[in-house]
Interface confidence: low
């Protein structure tokens, strides 16, 4: 006999935790579980912790198709293999003015004023077997040590003379000492190169493009360069177009038009000349005079300005 609400195995789905239901018969179903789950309805989270990878006392916490390691305080990372820096967490870990150095699974102290031991509270010399040159300071590290050199000494064991003492780097360059061979290394300031920073960098030959804009001429100088600008341009790199109209060169109420490297005056009726300074009686055409002014401007533009002229561009 039929029923108004016949049983459909997958409606609603009995599968939990994201499992997919598949009808296998009139009254039967099968759950296809997401990774990490098992059981007839995917109700069980598979334990991912057997033979886990947590180390250094890390506790395995099962997740969905994964696990996490809950690490002890001195370890971190996915498997508790990465060291925590206790020196950051415990500012007073070392007593008696000792310096804290981080170690795998803990920390160590580099002590001062005769103090020694794990926390600088006892008299054990951590650097007893170090071979730092006398006069240098030994700092204990994880399974090793480092030597802090006095002035004039360099190298991993402070056994080399510091080549920077003689100030071999010129032009205010920064001098560093190679810890392996004691040789100096100069970090040159802008504009200089070479082992001693004595060679000038020719900025004009350096790049494919001219550092001076608007066809300015690049002139190399010691440690730098400067630009000789075409008429009508100014600025350290000839980047500014000078507004020649700024000085109001046109007379008799004429209109000034700024041009590249020059200007043109559009005269009021009855005036002519480059600056509209000439009064005319007859109604002559002023066009020829305008062309003349432009011709002058064009010829002047062919020459370089000898020096920088600092104009204000508006």
């Amino acid at each position: 006999a039929g029923s108004d609400n016949p049983y459909v195995p997958c409606a609603p789905s009995p599968c939990v935790n994201g499992g997919t239901c598949r009808q296998t018969g009139d009254f039967t179903f099968e759950c296809s579980c997401l990774p990490g789950f098992e059981g007839s309805t995917c109700e069980r989270n598979i334990d991912d912790c057997p033979n886990h990878r947590c180390q250094n006392g890390g506790v395995c916490v099962d997740g969905v198709n994964t696990y996490n390691c809950r690490c002890p305080p001195q370890w971190t990372g996915q498997f508790c293999t990465e060291d925590v820096d206790e020196c950051l967490l415990q500012p007073n870990a070392c007593q008696n003015g000792g310096t804290c150095t981080n170690r795998n699974g803990g920390y160590g102290c580099v002590c001062v004023n005769g103090w020694s031991g794990d926390d600088c509270s006892e008299n054990i010399d951590d650097c007893a077997f170090a071979s730092c040159t006398p006069g240098s300071t030994c700092i204990d590290r994880v399974a090793s040590f480092s030597c802090m050199c006095p002035e004039g000494k360099a190298g991993l064991l402070c056994h080399l003379d510091d080549a920077c003492i003689s100030n071999p780097c010129h032009k205010g360059a920064l001098c560093d000492t190679n810890p392996l061979n004691g040789h100096y290394i100069c970090t040159c300031p802008q504009g200089y190169k070479g082992a001693d920073c004595t060679e000038d960098v020719d900025e004009c030959a350096m790049t494919n493009s001219n550092p001076c804009e608007h066809a300015g001429k690049c002139v190399n100088t010691d440690g730098a360069f400067h630009c000789e600008c075409l008429k009508g341009y100014a600025g350290p790199r000839c980047e500014m177009d000078i507004n020649e109209c700024h000085s109001d060169p046109c007379q008799n109420d004429a209109t000034c038009l700024d041009k590249i490297g020059g200007f043109t005056c559009l005269c009021m009726p009855g005036f002519k000349g480059v600056h509209c300074e000439i009064e005319i009686n007859e109604g002559n055409s002023g066009l020829n005079d305008i062309f003349e002014a432009q011709k002058i401007e064009w010829h002047e533009n062919l020459y370089f300005q000898g020096h920088h002229h600092h104009h204000h561009h508006h």
């Epitope: 180390q55 250094n56 997740g63 994964t66 996490n68 996915q78 498997f79 699974g105 399974a143």
Partner: antibody, heavy 117, light 112 residues
Framework: QVQLQQSGAELAKSGSSVKISCKAS????????IHWIKQTTGQAPEWTGY????????KFNEKFKGKATLTVDKSSTTAYMQLSSLTPVDTAVYYC??????????WGQGTLVTVSS | DVLMTQTPVSLPVSLGGQVSISCRSS???????????LHWFLQKPGQSPQLLIY???NRFSGVPDRFSGSGSGTDFTLKISRVEPEDLGVYYC?????????FGGGTKVEIK
């Protein structure tokens, strides 16, 4: 510095077993997992399994369960992998590698195992 | 197992040129701890693989800065900015987010 020194090449017959070693130095042996990785000529490496030296706990790639046995000797800081019931498909270079940063940070030079039928 | 797919399989390069190798995973490599455990290795002919980049973009000690790693989720890239002769060999990606750890098939970088 960290070093993993592996034993020399092995030539074995089908059905037999071999035991290869990986001597660790330059770090605290108990603090880091030792992995074993198989690489057949011209193929990508394949993770086989690992051992936690501190506890002796192991975990294997399903593919290698029953094939490999991993052990350590903490006193000599040496890890071992024994391969049993050898067949020609076990012919490969086997590497040991140290764990760190969730990856294999340092590798041994590899041990070539050749299985003849 | 997570499938790691590397492209291209072979990459002819010119010395001084730039190289880009892709690695795709069949599922997201973001671990529940927030980290992404995707790493890159180089295996030079006749040598063991060596770690170059760990957790997507961190250069391992001693690895030159011409090597860089990027990506997220399932898509990752290794770039070499200026190829040098010692960079030739097979590059592998590795995931260690999901058990078991799985390597990509490799990309052979060779001279054109």
């Amino acid at each position: 510095q960290v070093q993993l020194q592996q034993s020399g090449a092995e030539l074995a017959k089908s059905g037999s077993s071999v035991k290869i070693s990986c001597k660790a130095s330059g770090y605290t042996f108990s603090n880091y997992v030792i992995h074993w990785i198989k690489q057949t000529t011209g193929q990508a490496p394949e993770w086989t399994g690992y051992i936690i030296p501190g506890s002796g706990g192991t975990k294997f790639n399903e593919k290698f369960k029953g094939k490999a046995t991993l052990t350590v000797d903490k006193s000599s800081t040496t890890a071992y992998m024994q391969l049993s019931s050898l067949t020609p498909v076990d012919t490969a270079v086997y590497y040991c590698a140290r764990d760190g940063a969730g990856s294999f940070t340092y590798w041994g030079q590899g041990t070539l195992v050749t299985v003849s039928s | 197992d997570v499938l790691m797919t590397q492209t291209p399989v072979s990459l002819p390069v010119s010395l001084g040129g730039q190289v880009s190798i892709s690695c795709r995973s069949s599922q997201s490599l973001v671990h529940s701890d927030g980290n992404t455990y995707l790493h890159w290795f180089l295996q030079k002919p006749g040598q063991s693989p060596q770690l170059l980049i760990y957790r997507i973009s961190n250069r391992f000690s001693g690895v030159p800065d011409r090597f860089s790693g990027s990506g997220s989720g399932t898509d990752f890239t290794l770039k070499i900015s200026r190829v040098e002769p010692e960079d030739l060999g097979v590059y592998y990606c590795l995931q260690s987010t999901h058990f078991p750890d799985t390597f990509g098939g490799g990309t052979k970088v060779e001279i054109k």
